[in-house]
């Protein structure tokens, strides 16, 4: 089970967590694919970007995403960790000035053009096995993760740690 125990236990803290610095601690350019090796691609259609989950043809180039890593501090009364209670949040940008956003009302993942500072909807808590296999949890809606539904990215509610093993919220990062 890919997992983080006690989903409900820490969700309250995410709403109150604060990004500890306005600049990312590191950035990482990678292609994003599903656990089943389908590629996440981005296409400009009618002046807006669409996100697709699809099998690429052989030798077809994968789209890259800039992942910016930010440190976020748990509220100390929630985590009991004091200064050590840090987690990683990421923003994902496939092209200049566009970022993935969580649309919690529509349970959808969208690309929005925006300026910095980015809104909370653009931040996702990083959960990982290694740096090349990750899940993204909405900062604005704890317990909700980016996932794959009907060949599109969607927001998927994960209500227990057992459900964190579901492959549709797992993504692979690779440099190629």
């Amino acid at each position: 089970a890919f997992g983080i125990s006690g989903v409900q236990k820490y969700t309250r803290a995410l709403h109150d967590s604060s990004i500890t610095g306005i600049s990312p601690i590191t950035e990482y350019l990678a292609s994003l694919s599903t656990y089943n090796d389908q590629s996440i691609t981005f296409a400009l259609e009618d002046e807006s970007y669409e996100i697709y989950v699809e099998d690429l043809k052989k030798d077809e180039k994968k789209d890259k995403v800039l992942l910016s890593y930010y440190e976020s501090q748990h509220p100390s009364n929630e985590s009991g960790d004091g200064v050590d209670g840090k987690m990683l949040m990421v923003t994902l940008s496939p092209t200049k000035d566009f970022w993935l956003h969580a649309n919690n009302k529509e349970h959808s993942v969208e690309l929005h053009k925006c300026e910095k500072p980015l809104p909370d909807q653009a931040f996702f808590v990083l959960h990982n096995m290694h740096s090349n296999c990750v899940s993204f949890e909405c900062k604005t809606d704890p317990g909700v993760f980016i996932g794959v539904k009907d060949n599109h990215l969607a927001l998927i509610k994960v209500d227990s740690s057992e459900n964190l093993c579901t492959e549709n919220i797992l993504f692979k990062l690779s440099e190629t």
């Epitope: 890919f2 125990s5 820490y10 590191t26 990482y28 009991g80 004091g82 050590d84 209670g85 090349n132």
Partner: antibody
Framework: EVQLVETGGGLVQPGRSLKLSCVAS????????MYWIRQAPGMGLEWVSS????????YYLDSVKGRFTISRNNAENTVYLQMNSLRSEDTATYYC??????????????WGQGTLVTVSS | DIQMTQSPSVLSASVGDRVTLSCKAS??????LDWYQQKVGEAPKLLIY???NLQTGIPSRFSGSGSGTDYTLTISSLQPEDVATYFC????????FGQGTKVEIK
């Protein structure tokens, strides 16, 4: 204050077993990946094993696969390393470490003081 | 598997010197690199994470840099308390330490 206290080390004959324990305090144990790292006398550091927050994913150094088992009890804030079929080359100080970030397998944010395992006849 | 190679194995310098430790990865590790300090008889301690981020409580004379396969730890002005062995560590794919660089005072 974060504390990791390893116990269970000692002198053991080749082929025998030993179980190491690491009791954690000062942080929300179930939020963090935990690790075992070892250091043979006078040598460098060697990552041995990792376990994710809920214990569902475990990883091992090739040379200990099938012989060592990492596990955790989140209710008791404890991580274990069961070592079977011990060899002389397993002789080392074994350190327990916690992840630097909640939910992420990046970096060893804090280390225990270590427990010495000596495998010798 | 990713191999990490540190150089030099031993570095001797005077107090106040600027010292540079090198770490080379066998593949691109995307800045997923830490530096740990281990003093004799003590457990290792995290100094720098994600290539260039200073851990809380670590003096600012320590800094890290690098990208791709080549990484550096710099001590801007060596102090007697910096005598230790320094290990680089990658977590881009699996977990691997370098063999260490021992820093001594001349």
């Amino acid at each position: 204050e974060v504390q990791l206290v390893e116990t269970g080390g000692g002198l053991v004959q080749p082929g025998r077993s030993l179980k190491l324990s690491c009791v954690a305090s000062g942080f929300t144990f179930s939020n963090y990946w935990m690790y075992w790292i070892r250091q043979a006398p006078g040598m460098g550091l060697e990552w041995v094993s990792s376990i994710n927050n809920d214990g569902g994913n475990t990883y091992y150094l090739d040379s200990v696969k099938g012989r060592f088992t990492i596990s955790r009890n989140n209710a008791e804030n404890t991580v274990y390393l069961q070592m079977n079929s011990l060899r002389s080359e397993d002789t080392a100080t074994y350190y327990c470490a916690k992840g630097h970030y909640s939910y992420s397998s990046y970096s060893f944010g804090y280390w225990g003081q270590g427990t010495l395992v000596t495998v010798s006849s | 598997d990713i191999q990490m190679t540190q150089s030099p194995s031993v570095l001797s310098a005077s107090v106040g010197d600027r010292v540079t430790l090198s770490c080379k990865a066998s593949h691109n590790i995307n800045k997923h690199l830490d530096w740990y300090q281990q003093k004799v008889g003590e457990a290792p301690k995290l100094l720098i994470y994600f290539t260039n981020n200073l851990q809380t409580g670590i003096p600012s004379r320590f800094s890290g840099s690098g990208s791709g396969t080549d990484y550096t730890l710099t001590i801007s002005s060596l102090q007697p308390e910096d005598v230790a062995t320094y290990f680089c560590f990658q977590y881009n794919s699996g977990w691997t330490f370098g063999q260490g660089t021992k820093v001594e005072i001349k």
